[in-house]
């Protein structure tokens, strides 16, 4: 018979034949042959593989480094990675939670809508037209553009969400 060019789900093609993939939590020791099944071995104590695979090495569980403010939220198994979270009052810097911050700052162009608390991080909002923020801050709201008119001046340069307007003297028309 013709050697296969594609294999079923949970199989892989090697040496013109279809071998079973190793199940999650196990790594590949040796490929199948005409006469033997794929040989797999369970991952070690601090290792995991979370898919049907042909990996020869398991992945190390993530380390929740207490020096970075991390602690274990969910202990890893042979099929799942460890999930880290931050100590109480701290917030993850990313979905992967690789480090912790007290709170995040809002970038220029954004103002603070709500200051962080022990349970929620800073909430930022874009500065609307007529307002700006030129700093990175964890407490400052967007500031209103300067009103040149109230100073008897005119707008020389329009404001943006990151910059204030620039006011200048009115051109006096001579009679």
């Amino acid at each position: 018979p013709e050697p296969p060019t594609a294999c079923r789900e949970k199989q892989y093609l090697i040496n013109s034949q279809c071998c079973s993939l190793c199940q999650p939590g196990q790594k590949l020791v040796s490929d199948c042959t005409e006469f033997t099944e794929t040989e797999c071995l369970p991952c070690g104590e601090s290792e995991f593989l979370d898919t049907w695979n042909r990996e020869t090495h398991c992945h190390q569980h993530k380390y929740c480094d207490p020096n970075l403010g991390l602690r274990v939220q969910q202990k890893g198994t042979s099929e799942t990675d460890t999930i880290c979270t931050c100590e109480e009052g701290w917030h993850c810097t990313s979905e992967a939670c690789e480090s912790c911050v007290l709170h995040r700052s809002c970038s220029p162009g954004f103002g603070v809508k709500q200051i962080a608390t022990g349970v929620s991080d800073t909430i930022c909002e874009p500065c609307p037209v007529g307002f700006f923020s030129n700093v990175s801050s964890a407490f400052e709201k967007c500031h209103p553009w300067t009103s040149c008119e109230t100073k008897d001046l005119v707008v020389q340069q329009a404001g943006t969400n990151k910059t204030d307007v620039v006011c200048g003297p009115q051109d006096r028309l001579r009679a």
Partner: nanobody, 116 residues
Framework: EVQLLESGGGLVQPGGSLRLSCAAS????????MWWFRQAPGKGLERVSA????????YYADSVKGRFTISRDDTKNTLYLQMNSLRAEDTAVYYC?????????WRQGTLVTVSS
């Protein structure tokens, strides 16, 4: 290496005053927003006060408004917290922090005890 060293804590009677200092080194202090936090025994972290990089804007938690004053001296790379009319509930370890407020900048803090 970024270092923030808090000092000025101690034992004070209710109604008394203290001035905390935070000496900064290892970065350009001027222009950085700075915060004071505190943690009372067995409680979570509380945001006490903040000051903008320019010193022109400040923030105070409702619990300290009108009693505490935050300031900075960029020539001395130092942040201050003047605490007046102290109450028993102000007892805590006080910490200063800088953007990006990451855990690895966290230091010892200074203990303030308000008791008669």
């Amino acid at each position: 290496e970024v270092q923030l060293l808090e000092s000025g804590g101690g034992l004070v009677q209710p109604g008394g005053s203290l001035r905390l200092s935070c000496a900064a080194s290892g970065f350009t202090f001027a222009g950085y927003e700075m915060w004071w936090f505190r943690q009372a025994p067995g409680k979570g972290l509380e945001r006490v006060s903040a000051i903008s990089g320019s010193g022109g804007s400040t923030y105070y938690a409702d619990s300290v408004k009108g009693r505490f004053t935050i300031s900075r001296d960029d020539t001395k790379n130092t942040l201050y917290l003047q605490m007046n009319s102290l109450r028993a509930e102000d007892t805590a370890v006080y910490y200063c922090a800088k953007d990006p407020y990451s855990f690895d900048y966290w230091r010892q803090g200074t203990l303030v005890t308000v008791s008669s």
